[in-house]
Amino acid sequence: AVNGTSQFTCFYNSRANISCVWSQDGALQDTSCQVHAWPDRRRWNQTCELLPVSQASWACNLILGAPDSQKLTTVDIVTLRVLCREGVRWRVMAIQDFKPFENLRLMAPISLQVVHVETHRCNISWEISQASHYFERHLEFEARTLSPGHTWEEAPLLTLKQKQEWICLETLTPDTQYEFQVRVKPLQGEFTTWSPWSQPLAFRTKPAALGKDT
């Protein structure tokens, strides 16, 4: 279980969850491993069991408290270890001093809704979920619209460089079905990454008005 290439990556959702992924080529699927969290200035220790998500990849969530509680700050350091059972003992496979606000990945935006739709444009709003108040307005968003006959990968990215929880999509085709997604990222943190994409919101533009006979 030791010889394969291994990777240990964790992200903090900015509130009360640290999600970790451990991958190792050549490791046995039934290997028992866990993540142990040891903070430098908190009274708690936490452990989560790594569960298989693919052939050589395991994941778990360190749940630190109620979803919207602020369990860590910018000054916290949490030492994270991957421990795997080898016979009767646990072996440290990976270790890092984790700075939560250097390793952020927020929850996907929620509550997407169509505010107003016309023939060529559509106004959509959303909300961010479980995001720390520390960010104030220091967030950015990316959005994409799925057009008929295209894939999500082909959809151009629209960037919102500020905390703007709405968008007005323009130059749309009348009477056409679209889907829309958005994701969020704090500006803070060297290893911070984009949230997952939101659940797609389906909408249809209004038909063009029929021309009147003269």
Partner: nanobody, 126 residues
Framework: QVQLVESGGGLVQPGGSLGLSCAAS????????MSWVRQAPGKGLEWVAS????????DYADSVKGRFTVSRDNAKNTLYLQMNSLKPEDTAVYYC???????????????????RGQGTQVTVSS
């Protein structure tokens, strides 16, 4: 760009002590695990010790365990190696090395190093 500059090497008698320093620049020092490696004359690179970003985790090669201590001062962007009870077989060029992330993998300590310094010579001889 990343720069790692070692200092503190020299000639020391067996049983003596020496302290090495590594001044780091060009990256956020505390965000990365660091290590010391060495190369004896005519030999390959050998891992000596590793330390996590805030020094809460350390690990040593069996050959130096109990004699060497790795530490860091993130305010000064400096990595240290205190070497006690030195032996002739500790003679080598000592390099400070940066890992490519905050994570260090004890079973494979050579993995993930992306930069190392020019080295400082340590000679243990009577």
């Amino acid at each position: 760009q990343v720069q790692l500059v070692e200092s503190g090497g020299g000639l020391v008698q067996p049983g003596g002590s020496l302290g090495l320093s590594c001044a780091a620049s060009g990256f956020t020092f505390s965000n990365y695990a660091m290590s010391w490696v060495r190369q004896a004359p005519g030999k390959g690179l050998e891992w000596v010790a590793s330390i996590t970003g805030f020094g809460r985790g350390t690990d040593y090669a069996d050959s130096v365990k109990g004699r060497f201590t790795v530490s860091r001062d993130n305010a000064k962007n400096t990595l240290y190696l205190q070497m006690n009870s030195l032996k002739p077989e500790d003679t080598a060029v000592y390099y400070c090395a940066k890992y490519s992330s905050s994570t260090y993998y004890p079973p494979t300590p050579a993995r993930g190093r992306d930069y190392r310094g020019q080295g400082t010579q340590v000679t243990v001889s009577s």
